[in-house]
């Protein structure tokens, strides 16, 4: 966990609040050149396990909009365009950090939250269970 | 931008810091049951575009450990186990929020940062450029 700071020049926190609460600068530093998965790639359409992106919107959260991938098929798309049901399209999930407004009506107070999002889909060989 | 709150019961921020700085409670609320990409599924092994997970560690960042997917092949794995180079294994990327310690050694002061991570791989039909 994060502990009570003793560094000079660091913002101080009261012992009773710490280690729960920290100060976060919202001037986001963006380490990416392109932030657009749809424009930077059209993998969602070209994949053998194509997916659609659905919007998940919540004004009490930052980011307030998260895009969720939903696989288009149960199976995977073959070269001829038909779906092969001997293979499975499955969502690739990622746990991400979001900021949740807490208390709800306070615009500058947040709680860190982890949520699981589906980022895209991949084609996998199914696990076959043989019955004796 | 975000401005000085006047709501009673909300943490206050000094004008000089606001709208840049907010309070964040680090007691993470986890809406998920499993947090390990390797344990939650073995898609990385069963995919026709399999990947390896590489550990990206940075003690000045929260989360300090992020798992990066690296596709194992340029092509995609066929049913017979051979690689089909007429198809491409490509990484599915997602922009995520992390907290970066700033100033660097201050444990309770952070800056929000966006980074692009590869979550897994998917098999896509290549874009063929025809030369006149």
């Amino acid at each position: 966990g994060i502990a009570i700071p003793r560094n000079s020049g660091c913002p101080n926190s009261e012992d009773k609040n710490f280690p729960r609460t920290v100060m976060v600068n919202l001037n986001i530093h963006n380490r990416n050149t392109s932030t657009n998965p749809k424009r930077s790639s059209d993998y969602y359409n070209r994949s053998t396990s194509p997916w659609n992106l659905h919007r998940n919107e919540d004004p009490e959260r930052y980011p307030s909009v998260i895009w969720e991938a939903k696989c288009r098929h149960l199976g995977c798309v073959k070269a001829d365009g038909n779906v092969d049901y001997h293979m499975n399209s499955v969502p690739i999930q990622q746990e991400i950090l979001v900021l949740r407004r807490e208390p709800r009506h306070c615009p500058n107070s947040f709680r860190l939250e982890k949520i699981l999002v589906s980022v895209g889909c991949t084609c996998v060989t199914p696990i076959v269970h043989h019955v004796a | 931008g975000i401005a000085i709150p006047r709501n009673s019961g909300c943490p206050n921020s000094e004008d000089k810091n606001f709208p840049r700085t907010v309070m964040v409670n680090l007691n993470i609320h986890n809406r998920n049951t499993s947090t390990n990409p390797k344990r939650s599924s073995d898609y990385y092994n069963r995919s026709t575009s399999p990947w390896n997970l590489h550990r990206n560690e940075d003690p000045e960042r929260y989360p300090s450990v992020i798992w990066e997917a690296k596709c194992r092949h340029l092509g995609c794995v066929k049913a017979d186990g051979n690689v089909d180079y007429h198809m491409n294994s490509v990484p599915i990327q997602q922009e995520i929020l992390v907290l970066r310690r700033e100033p660097r050694h201050c444990p309770n002061s952070f800056r929000l940062e966006k980074i692009l991570v590869s979550v897994g791989c998917t098999c896509v039909t290549p874009i063929v450029h025809h030369v006149a």
């Epitope: 657009n36 998965p37 919107e57 004004p59 909009v65 | 931008g1």
Partner: antibody, heavy 122, light 110 residues
């Protein structure tokens, strides 16, 4: 300086079409913003038309009355958002504002342009 | 669509007066309401968001309150520069996002 500048307004005949532009400066279109259009008929109130996401995904929202006749698009390389208006009617005469919604708080418009006047008349 | 009913539509007052403008939503919008000030020939200017949070640079004589369906904008002591038209604006999301504005309140000198 962070600002929005609209252009493309003018006189158009009923049934005609017009494309308005909104050039953003001082910030870059990204996943942090939604770019919107709001109009105001002479002596009347403000009316939301629609918004387009400036990052990640091609996604738009429209007021129910605007869907079909009005189309919002963007060119991120030019940091510009557009409003294509078709089958224009006299009641579309208004000042058209470009406005920004910050992804940090999507509940309000945090930046407005100065507006461009569109007059629909024969 | 959610209807935003603003009242009064016009209001006359004097410098130093306390003024209250109300906005009612046709269904609950939590506290997702903003207030704007608009002067003739100018774009709207954000005053308050999330029902009660003062926007950057806005004088403290402006305040907002309310949640659910009923909201209020109060100017504690009118200044000459406050004579303008005021609009409330809501945010709503169901299957898609929408924003709506109240009809406006024109504040003039008595």
């Amino acid at each position: 300086e962070v600002q929005l500048v609209e252009s493309g307004g003018g006189l158009v005949q009923p049934g005609g079409s017009l494309r308005l532009s909104c050039a953003a400066s001082g910030f870059s279109f990204s996943s942090d913003y939604w770019m919107c259009w709001v109009r105001q008929a002479p002596g009347k109130g403000l009316e939301w038309i629609g918004c387009i996401y400036a990052g990640d995904v091609d996604d738009t929202d429209y007021a129910s009355w605007a869907r079909g006749r009005f189309t919002i698009s963007r060119d991120n390389s030019k940091n510009t958002v557009y409003l294509q208006m078709n089958s224009l009617r006299a009641e579309d005469t208004a000042v058209y504002y470009c406005a920004r919604v910050d992804g940090f708080d999507i509940t309000y418009f945090d930046l407005w342009g100065q507006g461009t006047l569109v007059t629909v008349s024969s | 669509d959610i209807q935003m009913t603003q009242s009064p539509s016009s209001l006359s007052a004097s410098v130093g007066d306390r003024v209250t403008i109300t906005c009612q939503a046709s269904q609950t919008i939590n506290y997702w309401l903003a207030w704007y000030q608009q002067k003739p020939g100018k774009a709207p200017k954000l005053l308050i968001y999330r029902a009660s949070t003062l926007a950057s640079g806005v004088p403290s004589r402006f305040s907002g309150s309310g949640s659910g369906t009923d909201f209020t904008l109060t100017i504690s002591s009118l200044q000459p520069e406050d004579f303008a038209t005021y609009y409330c604006q809501n945010y709503y999301y169901s299957t898609s996002r929408s924003y709506g504005f109240g009809g406006g309140t024109k504040l003039t000198v008595l």
